[in-house]
Every structure is written in C-alpha cells, then in structure tokens.
C-alpha cells in the first residue's frame, strides 16, 4: 500500500507540474473583484461600470473563457481527490499575497471550494486551504 501511495504521490506531483492553474486563478480573482464591484463596496465606485476599464474584467468573454480553461485543467484531477485538493491548495498559495484583507481572503477561499462543483466535478471532502493571514511576498 505504501508503494502504491508513493506512486500516487509521484503521479499527482507530475500532474500538478503539467497543469496550468493560471486560468483558475484569473477566473477566481475576477469573480471576487466583480462581486465587490456589483455591491459598490469600497474601494470600488458604485457609479462606475466596473467592467469597462480593464481588459480582464469584461463580464462575458474573459471570465467564462478562463472558467472553461480552468475546468479543463481541473478535470485532470477528477479521479484523485487528494490531488484535486493539492491543486486547490496551490491556487490558494499562488494568490494569497494578492489578498490583503480578511474579507477578500475568505471570499476567495469560498469561491475556490466551490470551483470543482462549478466545473461539474466532485469536490474533495476534506481540503485545508489555510495560508498565513495576509499572504506572503515570495520573491
């Protein structure tokens, strides 16, 4: 069994290395920013169309395209729940230093947990997405 787990870990590692999780990160960041925009919460202006200024914020094309590409990537982990969890943890780790507020971090985690389901995939039952609060600058 130990041998099998070792092979499983190696397989997961190589899957993670092959995977391009950026579309998932882009989709999630757009989603939580768009949610803030639509409620007019600080620092966004409620009077302003939140989607027009940035090429990354257009409601349709950009985000749904990212979601589609993200789901294609996550699909690779469908048969390995532990590996799916590691992919989600990697997404959280990659974006944690972009989230400098408790609210933003919690919202990102919430959306991240829902991601497999949004893609029509099984969500890992137990998956710890905790990072050090406020993220890290890793340069």
């Amino acid at each position: 069994r130990q041998q099998w787990e070792l092979q499983g870990d190696r397989r997961c590692q190589s899957q993670l290395e092959r995977a391009n999780l950026r579309p998932c990160e882009q989709h999630l960041m757009q989603k939580i920013q768009r949610d803030e925009d639509s409620y007019g919460r600080d620092p966004y202006s409620p009077s302003q169309d939140p989607y027009s200024p940035s090429p990354y914020d257009r409601r349709g094309a950009g985000s749904s395209q990212h979601q589609e590409r993200c789901c294609n990537e996550l699909n690779e982990f469908e048969n390995n729940q532990r590996c799916m969890c590691e992919a989600l943890q990697q997404i959280m780790e990659n974006q944690s230093d972009r989230l400098q507020g408790r609210q933003q971090e919690q919202q990102f985690k919430r959306e991240l947990r829902n991601l497999p389901q949004q893609c029509g995939l099984r969500a890992p039952q137990r998956c710890d997405l905790e990072v050090e609060s406020g993220g890290r600058d890793r340069y």
């Epitope: 950026r22 990160e25 882009q26 999630l28 960041m29 757009q30 920013q33 600080d42 620092p43 200024p53 940035s54 990354y56 990212h66 990659n94 974006q95 972009r98 989230l99 400098q100 507020g101 408790r102 609210q103 933003q104 050090e132 609060s133 406020g134 993220g135 890290r136 600058d137 340069y139």
Partner: antibody, heavy 118, light 111 residues
C-alpha cells in the same frame, strides 16, 4: 467616518529611537493590511513598511530593514512603527494607510512629522 | 527591486486642456492572475495622498471620470481629459506587484 490619526512625531537626535502610533476608527482595522509611507522634505513618497491583518507577515523597504519594526494592537485598533538608529535621511512626514484588500493604499492619515537632527 | 520612472517630472497645465503622465516600470507588473498591479495617487498641496486609479485602469470611489488609467506590462499612463484648478498637486504611480514602491512623482501646476 474613516479616520486614521498618527502621533508620536517630533525632533530626535541621530542614533536615537522614536515610536509612531496610528489610531484607527470607522474602519475594519483588524481586517486589512496596514502600511506606513513617508515623504521627506522636497522628495517624493516612499513606502516604508506593511503588516498583514493578522500581524503574521511584515514587509519592509530596504532603507529601513533591521532598524524599523511595524506592529499592531487589535484590541486598541492601533498601528505602530518603532524606529531605531534614526538617521538624518529618516526626516519626513510619516503617514499610515489602510490597504484596500487588493494591495492599494485606500485610506490615509494626515501624517506626523519626524525630524532627525543634532 | 522594481523601479518606476515617471515623466514628465513637472507638468504645467491649462485648465480645460487634457494632460497625461507616463509611468514606466523596470519589469512587468502583470501578475499571474492577469491583473496589472499599478496604482496612481494624487497628493494635493497640504493634504494626504489619495488613491485615484488601482490595478492600472480602475477608478477608485469618488474619483471624477475625467481621470483614467491605461497600460499594461511596463508602460502605463494617467490621463486627465480636462484639467481643473483643483487637480494641481503631485501625482505618483505605485507598483504593488513585489511589496510596494512609488515613482518619483510628477508635479502638476497651472500655467
């Protein structure tokens, strides 16, 4: 109404220490990263330090690393900047600022002047 | 360390006329999440700085729509479509990709 009020500035001799405070009200102080930024006379803005909302992560500009320490007291809604081994080039108006949650400096205090001179 | 270079350093303007400030970064400010981590701030005489534009092109709450930000990667621009007397002050770009650093500032004054 959002208010950030800095205090603790004054005249100090080179090599000495000073502690700045920033009292926050009307904002979710404990939910956001907080920053210190300074502006020296006749110069531009310089980011000095930041601390994450939980206080776990601290970031410093190279110019103050090892000399300045940023901290926060959530029970008092107060941000601090402990400045040791002060130099003449640390003379500036020091502002505290609250992060927007996405790495922008959204709310600013009115500033406190620190003068390092013998 | 990322270095931001603003130009011009001084900008005499005429009320009602457009104005623009450039900010060039020593490295790309696009994060892997697709956003450009570049902000614009204005410090009016005798006041604290205020956020105008964040993530290169998003206007902060309460900022008049005559202010707009554009650019991606290493080249960014702040435009004022029609300058008003109250727009005088020092404008700074700031990168937030790796910790935080400001450009040297552009002083905008009425001709």
């Amino acid at each position: 109404q959002v208010q950030l009020v800095e205090s603790g500035g004054g005249v100090v001799q080179p090599g000495r220490s000073l502690r700045l405070s920033c009292a926050a009200s009307g904002i979710a102080f404990n939910d956001y990263t907080m920053h210190w930024v300074r502006r020296a006379p006749g110069k531009g803005l310089e980011w000095v330090a930041a601390i994450s909302y939980g206080g776990t992560n601290k970031y410093y500009a190279d110019s103050v690393k090892g000399r300045f320490t940023i901290s926060r007291d959530s029970s008092k809604n107060t941000l601090y900047l402990q400045m040791n081994s002060l130099r003449a080039e640390d003379t500036a108006v020091y502002y505290c600022a609250r992060d927007s949650g996405y790495r922008s400096l959204l709310h600013w205090g009115q500033g406190t002047l620190v003068t390092v001179s013998s | 360390e990322i270095v931001l270079t603003q130009s011009p350093l001084s900008l005499p303007v005429t009320p009602g006329e457009p104005a623009s400030i450039s900010c060039r970064s020593s490295q790309s400010l696009v994060h892997r999440n697709g956003y450009n981590y570049l902000d614009w701030y204005l410090q009016k005489p005798g006041q604290s700085p205020q956020l105008l534009i964040y993530m290169a092109s998003k206007r902060a709450s309460g900022v008049p729509d005559r202010f707009s930000g554009s650019g991606s990667g290493t080249d960014f621009t702040l435009k004022i479509s029609r300058v008003e007397a109250e727009d005088v002050g020092v404008y700074y770009c700031m990168q937030a990709l790796q910790t935080w650093t400001f450009g040297q500032g552009t002083k905008v004054e009425i001709k």
